[in-house]
């Protein structure tokens, strides 16, 4: 299709080489309540539409995304050629930064309802470059935590080194929806609730003599509870003895509850004690079986191919640890009579 009629937007992604970050492009097609996908917008270039159309995933019309090769080759279907770019209804999500993401991205509706819709498309010219390390030492992270029940703030990473006074006007989106009532480089949240969690996008305009660009950054905001003050507790095994059949395989499960920690490094190991000897057993990887806001339950199993007489003289110890301390639970095997 002919892309010369597409509306054009220029975006700049200045990514940090120090941290992982994502990027998002919105397919800013006009309002869905009009009879066609495309119509002449009532907004002047300086106005922002009140919300991005099609932001509720249940109700979005599907759009097709393409990338325009710089050599003039035909448009490429994003889904086929770029595994690190995820198409999610009306957004394009870049999972990894890199200058190779630089290029022109085009979106248009999948369902063409009328000849007029053919020209309904948006072309986004994306320039990607690494942020110069000199620009700012303590710039805001692309992953920010808000402590539930307390005061917090969400900073726009690309502007966090500027004072509020010198900061340009910022356009914020939360989960693809415009936050029209917030225009500074930092959003203050007086009391944090779970609903403040989400993907925030901050945009501001940067102009030079030739053209103007939208500088965009994406912030993943997580609402968290305070770090636990407790060491982990072992939920299973409860009993210190376990009846077993000799010669049969056996799996002993260790389940432990770890309280939330912002820097979470749980330790879960199985040891075997035999007389004066003690050694760690290589067992399958631990796995998270339940995760909530406040805690996480982790399980790790020890597997015996067949129970021997020697195993009855041994003690099997599950050891769990977090930054506060450790807990153990010992299990002695007893032959079933």
């Amino acid at each position: 299709f002919n892309i010369s009629g597409c509306s054009t937007k220029k975006l700049l992604w200045a990514y940090s080489t120090r941290s992982e970050e994502e990027f998002i492009l919105f397919c800013d097609l006009p309002e869905p309540q009009k009879s066609h996908f495309c119509h002449r917008s009532q907004l002047s270039p300086t106005q922002v539409p009140d919300h991005l159309p099609f932001t509720d995933s249940k109700d979005l019309p599907d759009v097709q995304w393409y990338r325009q090769p710089s050599n003039g080759d035909p448009l490429e279907d994003i889904r086929k050629s770029y595994p690190h770019i995820i198409q999610d209804k009306c957004t394009l999500r870049f999972l990894t930064p890199g200058v190779n993401n630089t290029g022109s991205y085009i979106c248009r509706p999948k369902m063409i309802k009328s000849p007029y819709d053919v020209a309904c498309c948006v072309k986004m010219i994306l320039e990607v470059k690494p942020q110069s390390n000199a620009s700012c030492e303590n710039s805001a992270s692309h992953k920010q935590d808000l402590l539930l029940g307390s005061t917090g703030s969400i900073s726009c990473p690309s502007l966090s080194c500027q004072s509020d006074a010198q900061s340009p006007e910022v356009t914020w989106y939360k989960n693809g929806k415009l936050l029209s009532m917030t225009r500074s480089n930092r959003i203050v949240v007086d009391e944090v609730y779970i609903y403040h969690q989400g993907t925030y996008v901050c945009d501001y305009t940067q102009s030079d003599t030739a053209s103007s660009w939208t500088v965009r950054a994406v912030v993943q905001v997580r609402t968290i509870v305070g770090d636990t003050k407790l060491k982990p507790d072992i939920l299973d095994p409860v009993e210190s003895t376990l009846e077993v059949e000799l010669g049969k395989p056996l799996t002993i499960s260790c389940k432990a509850r770890f309280g939330f920690e912002r820097v979470f490094n749980p330790v879960m190991k199985w040891y075997i004690k035999d007389a004066d000897l003690e050694w760690e057993v290589s067992v399958p990887e631990a796995k998270s079986i339940k995760s909530t806001l406040k805690d996480e339950i982790i399980e790790r199993n020890i597997i015996l191919e067949k129970v021997t007489q020697r195993d009855l003289r041994r003690t099997f110890v599950c050891f769990v640890q977090n930054s506060i301390g450790n807990t153990t639970q010992s299990v002695q095997l007893k032959e079933k009579r």
Epitope: K58, M181, D190, H196
Partner: antibody, heavy 123, light 107 residues
Framework: QVQLVQSGAEVKKPGASVKVSCKAS????????MHWVRQAPGQGLEWMGI????????TYAQKFQGRVTMTRDTSTSTVYMELSSLRSEDTAVYYC????????????????WGQGTTVTVSS | DIQMTQSPSSLSASVGDRVTITCRAS??????LNWYQQKPGKAPKLLIY???SLQSGVPSRFSGSGSGTDFTLTISSLQPEDFATYYC?????????FGGGTKVEIK
């Protein structure tokens, strides 16, 4: 408890302006957006706009753009709604209403309302 | 602007009746819908937010359902204090818009 107290009734001539105040108490004033809604006699509810008391940012309904101004005074926890170039159709009860969720978020609903201010426009 | 259409515009019912009011949006609004009750000479009162969540302090006989474009407010057993006008309101995008209202009168 959370309360919104509005200024008293006003009678105005066509072409004049009216400024209605809404004093908030019982909660952190800057944490919640404030809406303005009006209701003409015997009619339904009509949303006029919203103000963020923290930064003073506003969004107005297109119908009132150019005629309405919403402001706030954080020192007195008061928001104001001024409507200019009044006409007889502006005769209504004007309500301020607090947004139900701590900003910034999706609009949730207006959980606390002022008692309303009757504005009569008559020559 | 998103148009909100409420039906019926009025209804007569008796104490103990089950009452259902519907609201239709001109485009999908997901679950961004609120219901209010208003009595003569008083300010509206929030009953339901996010289509189905009961505002604190509101009796459990009030319930809301729906998503997308079609929504319902149900009063399971009408009480004398429930005779009032009910409004739906979308909070999906500005301008926020209200339905025309449904007046619930005594039969």
């Amino acid at each position: 408890q959370v309360q919104l107290v509005q200024s008293g009734a006003e009678v105005k001539k066509p072409g004049a302006s009216v400024k209605v105040s809404c004093k908030a108490s019982g909660y952190t004033f800057t944490s919640y957006y404030m809406h303005w809604v009006r209701q003409a006699p015997g009619q339904g509810l009509e949303w006029m706009g919203i103000i963020n008391p923290r930064g003073g940012y506003t969004t107005y309904a297109q119908k009132f753009q150019g005629r309405v101004t919403m402001t706030r005074d954080t020192s007195t926890s008061t928001v104001y709604m001024e409507l200019s170039s009044l006409r007889s159709e502006d005769t209504a009860v004007y309500y301020c209403a607090k947004e139900g969720r701590v900003s910034p978020t999706d609009y949730y609903g207006m959980d606390v309302w002022g008692q309303g201010t009757t504005v009569t426009v008559s020559s | 602007d998103i148009q909100m259409t409420q039906s019926p515009s009025s209804l007569s019912a008796s104490v103990g009746d089950r009452v259902t009011i519907t609201c239709r949006a001109s485009q999908s609004i997901s679950s961004y819908l609120n219901w209010y009750q208003q009595k003569p000479g008083k300010a509206p009162k929030l009953l339901i937010y996010d289509a189905s969540s009961l505002q604190s302090g509101v009796p459990s006989r009030f319930s809301g359902s729906g998503s997308g474009t079609d929504f319902t407010l149900t009063i399971s057993s009408l009480q004398p204090e429930d005779f009032a006008t009910y409004y739906c309101q979308q909070s999906y995008s500005t301008p926020l818009t209200f339905g025309g209202g449904t007046k619930v009168e005594i039969k």
